[in-house]
Amino acid sequence: MAVTACQGLGFVVSLIGIAGIIAATCMDQWSTQDLYNNPVTAVFNYQGLWRSCVRESSGFTECRGYFTLLGLPAMLQAVRALMIVGIVLGAIGLLVSIFALKCIRIGSMEDSAKANMTLTSGIMFIVSGLCAIAGVSVFANMLVTNFWMSTANMYTGMGGMVQTVQTRYTFGAALFVGWVAGGLTLIGGVMMCIACRGLAPEETNYKAVSYHASGHSVAYKPGGFKASTGFGSNTKNKKIYDGGARTEDEVQSYPSKHDYV
């Protein structure tokens, strides 16, 4: 039960995280005009990975896409790449994890296969989350560097008389969305990896021996774990004891008089 819950929760957390990564990637507010210690302007500038926007106080907003590829800074291209890789890995991870969920029965898929798929999706989520966090962090670092550079020459004097307003940019909402989303995807991935361990416990090395107690038919099968779905044809709720460790995720079988090894 705990394994199923962990797996399900991991899936949900990762799903929210990946939705957040997609949202962050599409958002226009990666960097926003810094309003502190700046002349108050009647326009507000903000920029995303794909376009830059200007919102006039009068209510009009105009956005222009970056229609060049080669003219863009390498760092911006790197951030785009990281976010897209994160989304792609996350999407594949989600697809894999859907089939890996214990609560979903797909034919006669064994627990070992589900465990492998859970681990695969978990790793994908972890890498996806790391990509998003890395992408957002690279962009944030770029902003900080540019911020202090523009602060150093806040006003560019021209002829000693005329002043040019330097627009400084600070962290936009998308950065925080990206960090949180990346973190959630990472946590979801870790949870999937933990769930994978519960789905496929390690086999013990001692030989399986079956004892018949008089009057009671209870099979003792140490180390006799067989990976399978919880949805086999035999779903009678009998107990099996595996080397003293009880697992709820195994296929139950009736003891018979031929159970001796």
Partner: antibody
Framework: QVQLKESGPGLVAPSQSLAITCTVS????????VSWVRQPPGKGLEWLGV???????HYHSALISRLSIRKDNSKSQVFLKVNSLQTDDTATYYC???????????WGQGTSVTVSS | DIVMTQSPSSLTVTAGEKVTMSCKSS????????????LTWYQQKPGQSPKLLIY???TRESGVPDRFTGSGSGTDFTLTISSVQAEDLAVYYC?????????FGGGTTLELK
Amino acid sequence: QVQLKESGPGLVAPSQSLAITCTVSGFSLTTYGVSWVRQPPGKGLEWLGVIWGDGSTHYHSALISRLSIRKDNSKSQVFLKVNSLQTDDTATYYCGKPGRGNAMDYWGQGTSVTVSS
Amino acid sequence: DIVMTQSPSSLTVTAGEKVTMSCKSSQSLLNSGNQKNYLTWYQQKPGQSPKLLIYWASTRESGVPDRFTGSGSGTDFTLTISSVQAEDLAVYYCQNDYIYPLTFGGGTTLELK
């Protein structure tokens, strides 16, 4: 069709307060702002202040202590209040709607205010 | 505050003549975000409310005749009337629509001979 109409007292005594109402139609005050401009007789235009759709206000720095702009979105009205009037506050007061480029694309016909005892 | 300086303060021209008037601002009105200059030109005829002619320094308002042209960038701007008509007799104002307070220039009065 966008329209703005100012209504004021016409004559105000010095040191008193001036209250002018700008009633708008054809656009919503929740989305668009309203600017106030005045013009003393025979002189140029002087920007007084603005109230934007989100309710934020900005004022002429020399008049900030005497000016206040507020609005009633439901009644489509914007109010300009000028305190401690002096004779040089005698002017025609205009309200206008800022559009693209924050430029005032629509203006009221103006209301003439004389400050005199 | 940004100081807007218009020159000349008055112009006397004959119909059909080309006219240029200048507007200078003490700070740049160029917004780096969209590379647009937030300078506006208004026309005010005697006894009337001002009328918007040009915004973003060079974009004509709809319904404004194409003989009116705005140009310039940063701090230096120009309004040109390619062929002055009798109905163009008015005062022309420039306004900073970028940095608060949104100050006006002193105006250029256009008179006909």
